[in-house]
Interface confidence: low
């Protein structure tokens, strides 16, 4: 029969060239001399001359190595004519399938990937996804099937396996508890992609994981006890600046302090505001104090943050003893 089964040719063949692939044969050659030819892309149209045919024997020839990543399949037509040029067969479809070799390494889509995750998250939390591509075939072979792995983690605190990467998808997740921005605010992971589903060529990239702040540190008074002196009758007088420390990210709602007078201000004589830069609590008089009525006030001030705590934290309290100083007032008649 004037039929050729699909021909498979591995890419990157070593030759020697021309290399015989298959023989075209018409059974009409019993009656007359047959001349064979081929047409189509790869024969008489671009890329021309990749394939040829021995005119009299019908041997299909490959003239040079093939590249599957350039052209994965060639569709040619075989022709058979008699000596006088008359066609003796209908044009025959010749399919040449280029089979894959593992001739490409995986490539990450970026040299450096960047992601972030909130401190204190539970294991299993997804951080980011990295991607590598491989030009080789991943459908019929494992040549282009990429497996991801984490090669190293910097720093290695609190231990060296804080993250894992999904072998197939490249999704990086938290695998251990203990992410603490105040101790380690960022990790650098060296990630690898290996073709042949993990048994082939490897390429490397970097994933930088930023640990985002959560309000897991309470502001703490330092010191916790203050003594101040205020002249009586003074309104808007700065009594004392209260200092707090907070380990959370500076100038964030988790760091910014909110002060509340919890006790000792029965007459509503005092107010406290937060200094926007230093985060100190500025205690001032809202009304004038009266030495003759009360010469000492003991205030209890509690500090929290603008943002709510993400876990149960003890709140810090400061004690301020305010001594009211006598001012020589004019007699009242």
């Amino acid at each position: 029969d004037w039929v050729v089964a699909p021909i498979s040719v591995p890419e990157n063949g070593k030759g020697p060239f021309p290399q015989r692939l298959n023989q075209l044969k018409s059974n009409k050659d019993r009656d007359t001399k047959i001349f064979y030819s081929i047409t189509g892309p790869g024969a008489d149209s671009p890329p021309e001359g990749v394939f040829a045919v021995e005119k009299e024997t019908g041997w299909l020839l490959l003239n040079k190595p093939l590249d599957r990543e350039e052209i994965a399949k060639y569709e040619l037509f075989g022709h058979a004519v008699s000596e006088n040029g008359a066609s003796v067969e209908d044009p025959m479809n010749i399919s040449i399938i280029v089979t894959d070799q593992n001739d490409h390494k995986p490539k990450f889509t970026q040299d450096t990937f960047r992601g972030s995750v909130l401190e204190g998250v539970l294991p299993g939390t997804s951080v980011m996804q990295v991607t590598a591509t491989d030009e080789d075939d991943a459908i019929y072979t494992y040549n282009g099937v990429v497996a991801y792995s984490i090669h190293s983690q910097e720093p290695k605190d609190p231990h060296d396996l804080m993250f894992t990467i999904h072998r197939s998808t490249g999704t990086i997740s938290v695998i251990s508890s203990g992410l603490d921005r105040e101790k380690v605010p960022e990790y650098t992971l060296t990630i690898q992609a290996t073709d042949m589903d993990g048994d082939g060529s490897t390429t490397t990239a970097v994933a930088v994981v930023e640990i985002l702040d959560a309000n897991d540190n309470a502001p703490m008074f330092d010191p916790q006890k203050y003594e101040a002196h205020v002249p009586e009758n003074a309104v808007g007088h700065e009594v004392q600046r209260l200092t707090v420390t907070d380990l959370d990210a500076p100038n964030s709602p988790a760091w910014r302090a909110t002060y509340l007078i919890m006790g000792g201000d029965d007459g509503d004589h005092f107010t406290i505001t937060t200094h926007p830069e230093s985060n100190q609590g500025i205690l001032t008089t809202r009304k004038g104090l009266d030495f003759e009525a009360k010469n000492q006030h003991t205030l209890y001030v509690e500090v929290t943050n603008e943002a709510p705590f993400v876990l149960k934290l003890p709140t810090s309290t400061a004690t301020i003893v305010v001594h009211v100083e006598d001012v020589n007032e004019a007699p009242v008649f």
Partner: antibody, heavy 123, light 113 residues
Framework: EVQLLESGGGLVQPGGSLRLSCAAS????????INWVRQAPGKGLEWVGV???????NYASSVKGRFTISRDNSKNTVYLQMNSLRAEDTAVYYC?????????????????WGQGTLVTVSS | DIVMTQSPDSLAVSLGERATINCKSS????????????FAWYQQKPGQPPKLLIY???TRESGVPDRFSGSGSGTDFTLTISSLQAEDVAVYYC?????????FGQGTKLEIK
């Protein structure tokens, strides 16, 4: 005062090997990544590679597979092992301290540099 | 790799005048999560190692005179010397540290006119 001092440069034949050292002082050495940067005669700067605090490394594609960076935190020293040297590796080699420990410190910028050591690859 | 291209290759400016050097990267150096540009400027005088001038594209390194300023974002960056001094004669390099491998520009030679 932060100081970095390179040594080990010299003349080597193509295909040969050389090991450069970078001795550091004046800062918490083990906490900082250290870079190697080279400069061919009359040319610009080329980043060679970096070693992170725990020993992880990254390299320029032109030296990958031929050069290896290592560190000995007990000696405050970083090493650059150069194998299969080529004429185009001829350069002054600088070691440079990363500006910060973390990315957000501007870790990729290099704030202190050694004076450099000359490596000449020639037959 | 990210390619850094400086312009001009050389520049002559009179003492006291403004000098401007440009650097263009082949991809954006702005990281959206922290809105920082992973970009630095260096100065190298003859026979000396480079000196860090600017990081994060616009933050002056400690001890660098305030006549040096950096600006720009994404792919286009500028180093400006507001009033050129004799000691500013040097080659200036830009560098990206967004992505490994880190890469430098080819350098701009600054001379006095």
């Amino acid at each position: 005062e932060v100081q970095l001092l390179e040594s080990g440069g010299g003349l080597v034949q193509p295909g040969g090997s050389l090991r450069l050292s970078c001795a550091a002082s004046g800062f918490s050495f083990s906490s900082y990544p250290i870079n190697w940067v080279r400069q061919a005669p009359g040319k610009g700067l080329e980043w060679v590679g970096v070693i992170w605090t725990g020993g992880g490394t990254n390299y320029a594609s032109s030296v990958k597979g031929r050069f290896t960076i290592s560190r000995d935190n007990s000696k405050n020293t970083v090493y650059l092992q150069m194998n299969s040297l080529r004429a185009e590796d001829t350069a002054v080699y600088y070691c440079a301290k990363s500006r910060g420990v973390y990315d957000f410190d501007g870790r990729g910028a290099m704030d202190y540099w050694g004076q450099g050591t000359l490596v000449t690859v020639s037959s | 790799d990210i390619v850094m291209t400086q312009s001009p290759d050389s520049l002559a400016v009179s003492l006291g005048e403004r000098a401007t050097i440009n650097c263009k990267s082949s991809q954006s150096l702005l990281y959206s999560s922290n809105q920082k540009n992973y970009f630095a400027w260096y100065q190298q005088k003859p026979g000396q190692p480079p000196k860090l001038l600017i990081y994060w594209a616009s933050t002056r390194e400690s001890g660098v005179p305030d006549r040096f300023s950096g600006s720009g974002s994404g792919t286009d960056f500028t180093l400006t010397i507001s009033s050129l001094q004799a000691e500013d004669v040097a080659v200036y390099y830009c560098q990206q540290y967004y992505s490994y491998p880190y890469t430098f520009g080819q350098g701009t030679k600054l001379e006095i006119k």
